[in-house]
Interface confidence: low
């Protein structure tokens, strides 16, 4: 019996087609992805093949103005339209709190939403009961397939799930659910979840009874043969893991942003064992037409976005200096504003010993593309912020050793004075440079804000200590020459859309007046 698994993950609000790098579509003839194009391909496969499941491995939420405005209603609407069969909860599904998950998505989805390792307690338990499930048995042709869900147990550090949801260890939580499926005579089981490729592989190895793992969170691109676009494969598709009980378990992921549709064909024997698996992600490029019905609906929903982007988010009573002349040479108040917003967006008081889990932000000055003039009645709109942060990136959480941070700050000024983008703006960091010294030895003082303290204060950076830092995904991926970050980071979790972080902060503060306050000094 053959099953076709179509899968997406980390779509992050890319409902419309995008450019090849998953930013805003500029030249339509070269654009990719989007739900209208995805629908065309899914329907084509559904017509051609008998047993098809369309699955999503989480993080539909967060990433573009679509989510900012519609807050998840767009996810439910278009996933319903595409007739997804199941979805696993990702960490970003909790970005607007539990209510922001329940109302727009859980109550509106016409497909099961899954996670076996999230347990509700207190008053929330009855409120959320039945709205998400640990697993679901789906009839496919003449057979049944069990889908069991999982979510990153780091979610409390990455999003806003509140205090009434417990995120258990994935493997511990999955095993009893898979065992229960077995007692229901379900012998074909897919683990669908959002914990990253390393955990996906562990689940394939450790959870008895799981036949296939469909994952997300790490934006992993797997491919067999010559890859069709810019993404470099982390391994073959599917990636085969040998389980502890000797089975070959295919593990798949489909990069991110709706650029690819994962396509995996599995052949099962009559006892539900995987005999063979093969496939590849399908690049959703412009050779695949956008479905006109879905496209019309996208255009209908777009109207509200255009209206939103010109509305006032808040006011500034000072000039927000985002000029290259400032942000690539010295501390600029636009950099301070953005870093303050980044830290504020990551406030998670999850431990009495720590006032917060992260206190530091770094931001490449070249990523700040425009100032905002306060003389327009102080008004700040989404449109204004899109000029400051036009690349559609995310502000991510990484863990780095102090020695890596020191290298990053040396790189920040290694060719100072040429208006290059790698000059770092900061938050929760005091840095002093001496430009008279040779490149690679210009950082004379680097103090960082403590987290394990009741009264935050600045202490000297310790080379062997592991620190959490918020930074743009561009830097996490080694952009602007920050190869040491990419090579040496110990953990990387994708964060929220950059503009959304800053706009939320401004809306919260209502009136802002960031200053230049001595975070970056030259001796």
């Amino acid at each position: 019996w053959e099953l076709t698994i179509l899968h997406t993950n980390d779509v992050h609000s890319r409902l419309e087609q995008t450019s090849e790098d998953s930013s805003k579509c500029v030249n339509a003839s070269r654009c990719m992805g989007g739900v209208a194009r995805l629908f065309t391909k899914v329907q084509q496969i559904r017509r051609a093949e008998p047993n098809v499941l369309l699955l999503d491995a989480g993080d539909q939420y967060q990433g573009t103005i679509w989510f900012t405005v519609y807050k998840g209603a767009e996810v439910a609407h278009f996933m319903n339209a595409l007739r997804y069969d199941a979805m696993a909860l990702g960490n970003h599904e909790f970005d607007n709190g539990v209510e922001g998950l329940i109302e727009p998505l859980l109550k509106e989805a016409k497909f099961p939403i899954l996670s076996a390792n999230i347990k509700a307690k207190g008053p929330l338990a009855s409120q959320i009961s039945g709205l998400y499930l640990p697993y679901k048995v789906l009839p496919v042709g003449d057979e049944v397939v069990g889908i069991v869900g999982y979510t990153s147990k780091e979610t409390p550090f990455l999003s806003n799930p509140g205090t009434n949801l417990v995120f258990e260890d994935e493997i511990t939580a999955l095993q009893p659910e898979v065992d229960k499926l077995k007692t229901l005579n379900v012998n074909k089981i897919i683990a669908l979840g959002h914990s990253g490729f390393e955990m996906d592989k562990l689940i394939a190895q450790k959870v008895r009874g799981v036949d296939v793992v469909v994952g997300g969170h790490s934006n992993t691109f797997l491919y067999t043969g010559n890859p069709p676009s810019k993404e470099v494969p982390a391994g073959k598709y599917p990636f085969i893991v040998t389980s502890d009980d000797g089975r070959k378990v295919p593990v798949v992921q489909a990069y991110a942003f709706g650029k690819y549709l994962g396509y995996l064909k599995i052949e099962f024997d009559e006892r539900g064992n995987v005999i063979s698996s093969h496939g590849n992600p399908i690049l959703l490029n412009s050779s695949i037409p956008e479905d006109p019905s879905i496209k019309a609906d996208i255009n209908k929903w777009r109207i509200k976005l255009d209206n939103y982007s010109t509305q006032e988010l808040g006011k500034t009573i000072v000039y927000l200096d985002g000029s290259s002349q400032s942000c690539r040479f010295r501390e600029c108040n636009m950099g301070n504003l953005i870093c303050d917003a980044m830290i504020n967006n990551n406030l998670r008081h999850t431990d009495e010993m720590f006032w917060n889990h992260v206190s530091m932000c770094i931001l490449n000055g070249g990523g700040i593309r425009s100032p905002i003039d306060e003389r327009n009645n102080g008004t700040i709109t989404w449109e204004n912020l899109a000029a400051v942060l036009p690349f559609g990136g995310t502000f991510d959480l990484v863990q780095l050793k102090g020695s890596t941070l020191k290298k990053a700050f040396e790189h920040s000024v290694h060719r100072y004075g040429q208006s290059t983008g790698e000059f770092l703006q900061v938050g929760g960091i005091h840095v002093v440079y001496d430009l008279s010294r040779k490149p690679g030895d210009r950082v004379v003082k680097l103090d960082v804000l403590c987290t394990k303290c009741r009264v935050p204060s600045y202490d000297p950076l310790k080379m062997d200590e592991v620190y959490k830092v918020i930074l743009p995904n561009f830097l996490a991926n080694g952009g602007d020459g920050f190869q040491m970050i990419k090579d040496e980071l110990l953990r990387h979790d994708s964060g929220d859309q950059d503009i959304n972080v800053v706009s939320t902060y401004i809306s919260k503060m209502k009136v802002i007046y960031p200053a230049v306050e001595g975070r970056i000094k030259f001796s």
Epitope: Y70, N80, R83, S293, D297, K300, I303, K304, N307
Partner: antibody, heavy 119, light 107 residues
Framework: QVQLVQSGAEVKKPGASVKVSCKAS????????MHWVRQAPGQGLEWMGA????????SYAQKFQGRVTMTVDTSTSTVYMELSSLRSEDTAVYYC????????????WGQGTLVTVSS | DIQMTQSPSSLSASVGDRVTITCKAS??????LAWYQQKPGKAPKLLLY???SLETGVPSRFSGSGSGTDYTLTISSLQPEDFATYYC?????????FGGGTKVEIK
């Protein structure tokens, strides 16, 4: 309360044009679509098109493309629908109707304007 | 265009009767369905949207159900003021289209 008040009945000759107005009050005019729906005598309802006053975005039913023009005057919260090259089968009651921007069902309707096309 | 087929086109019923009107779409409309009531010489009035959501001020004797392409409007106990023509409308795909109407008359 929400009100949509339309202009009065019109009698037109074949080939002529008619312009019907719809004045809105009681809500934020620029945040809802305004639709035009017509109903021929004894017949059902037929959607003609819609305009979003917030940015002037218009969508027309293919059937009326080239013959219908929808415009908006935000200063008076008024939407206009002009239908040209009239023929006898355009005799109908024309309604304006408010629709939410993301879900196009019609929660408030004008009282209707009867347009009679006769030689 | 999506065709909306309503049935029956007319029906006779008495006060207190349970009345059911069906609406079939020519393709899936993903629960983007509204129902309207129209009385002679008057504009239509919204009863339900999203298949099941009752518009404010509409009596609870009106209810909706269905999914995919098949939808139903039910009036649990017909009242004198309910004698009218009822229309369904899909708002999934432009152009938005209406059913042909069902006239509910007094038996």
């Amino acid at each position: 309360q929400v009100q949509l008040v339309q202009s009065g009945a019109e009698v037109k000759k074949p080939g002529a044009s008619v312009k019907v107005s719809c004045k809105a009050s009681g809500y934020t005019f620029t945040t809802y679509n305004m639709h035009w729906v017509r109903q021929a005598p004894g017949q059902g309802l037929e959607w003609m098109g819609a305009i979003f006053p917030g940015n002037g975005h218009i969508s027309y039913a293919q059937k009326f493309q080239g013959r219908v023009t929808m415009t908006v005057d935000t200063s008076t919260s008024t939407v206009y629908m002009e239908l040209s090259s009239l023929r006898s089968e355009d005799t109908a009651v024309y309604y304006c109707a408010r629709g939410d921007y993301d879900e196009s069902y019609f929660d408030y309707w004008g009282q209707g304007t009867l347009v009679t096309v006769s030689s | 265009d999506i065709q909306m087929t309503q049935s029956p086109s007319s029906l006779s019923a008495s006060v207190g009767d349970r009345v059911t009107i069906t609406c079939k779409a020519s393709e899936g409309i993903y629960n983007r369905l509204a129902w309207y009531q129209q009385k002679p010489g008057k504009a239509p009035k919204l009863l339900l949207y999203g298949v099941i959501s009752l518009e404010t001020g509409v009596p609870s004797r009106f209810s909706g159900s269905g999914s995919g392409t098949d939808y139903t409007l039910t009036i649990s106990s017909l009242q004198p003021e309910d004698f009218a023509t009822y229309y369904c409308q899909q708002y999934w795909s432009i152009p938005w289209t209406f059913g042909g109407g069902t006239k509910v008359e007094i038996k």
